[in-house]
Amino acid sequence: ENSTSPLSADPPVAAAVVSHFNDCPDSHTQFCFHGTCRFLVQEDKPACVCASGYVGARCEHADLLAVVAASQKKQ
């Protein structure tokens, strides 16, 4: 089966699993709210790689710590 290199830990994998992965199918374009869908080969299920500033299984929550840190950096 086709697989690529493991998911990097940065950005974090919402499913908290590091594994080989495939692209998700077209049907899953809206599976992740603020991130990229990756289909985990071993677990045989989709997972989300969250965009910076988002967390949660579907990257559905803004990471308040990241928001605070970013605003402090600006100051």
Epitope: E1, D23, D26, S27, Q30, F39, D44, K45, R58
Partner: antibody
């Protein structure tokens, strides 16, 4: 081991409603979409629609848009398929399913017979 | 996405190597399944991801992919393999199925 257990056969009158269930074990339904498929006697397979149990979002094949309602209860790890205003055309076997790349999972099917 | 099984029926002999084909109208990137169905029974999933044989399915079954063309092979047909076979794409929604290929003994 992942198992999809569907509710038993139903015999209902035309015009009535019915709700079929699919209880999943060995897999958290919030982790992926759950789908329903129809097969009429001696015919092929037809996709009805799907639900994202994590948020309740649904998507239907156009012909089932006004006929079927798919819901899910994450506390019991169960997906449901409800029909309204049943006609003889709805007589079929209905399957719940979830497909991965390496494995696929199907329920055993629920036979729905619409007859007066 | 349309899935076309060019043969609705195939006349075969026991022991034959059987090839069933399925063509997708668009690229589905191997998100394809094969099912076996016997009269009065539920479809039985044989292969997912175009090539991944489901646990418990005999090794005489195999799947392959080339572009938009997908193939189910049975190396030596057994009596219990006489059935109708369906392909299905699950790359995009709506999921779509081929019309089925029925194997009939000569």
């Amino acid at each position: 081991e992942v198992q999809l257990q569907q509710s038993g056969a139903e015999l209902v009158r035309p015009g009535a409603s019915v709700k079929l269930s699919c209880t999943v074990s060995g897999f958290n339904i919030k982790d992926d979409y759950m789908h329903w498929v129809k097969q009429r006697p001696e015919q092929g397979l037809e996709w009805i629609g799907r639900i994202d149990p994590a948020n309740g979002h649904t998507k239907y094949a156009p012909k089932f848009q006004d006929k079927a309602t798919i819901t899910a209860d994450t506390s019991s790890n169960t997906a449901y398929l409800q029909f309204s205003s049943l006609t003889s055309e709805d007589t079929a076997v209905y399957y719940c399913t979830r497909m991965g790349l390496r494995r696929g999972y199907w329920g055993q099917g629920t036979t729905l017979t619409v007859s007066s | 996405i349309q899935m076309t099984q060019s043969s609705s029926s195939l006349s075969v002999s026991l022991g034959d190597r059987v090839t069933i084909t399925c063509k997708a109208s668009e690229h589905i990137n191997s998100w394809l399944a094969w099912y076996q169905q016997k009269p009065g029974n539920a479809p039985r999933l044989l292969i997912s991801g175009a090539t991944n044989l489901k646990t418990g399915v005999p090794s005489r079954f195999s799947g392959s992919a080339s572009g938009k063309d997908y193939t189910l092979n049975i190396t030596s047909l057994q009596t219990e393999d006489v059935a109708t076979y369906y392909c299905q794409q699950y790359w995009g929604t709506p999921w779509t199925f081929g019309g089925g290929t029925k194997l009939e003994i000569k």
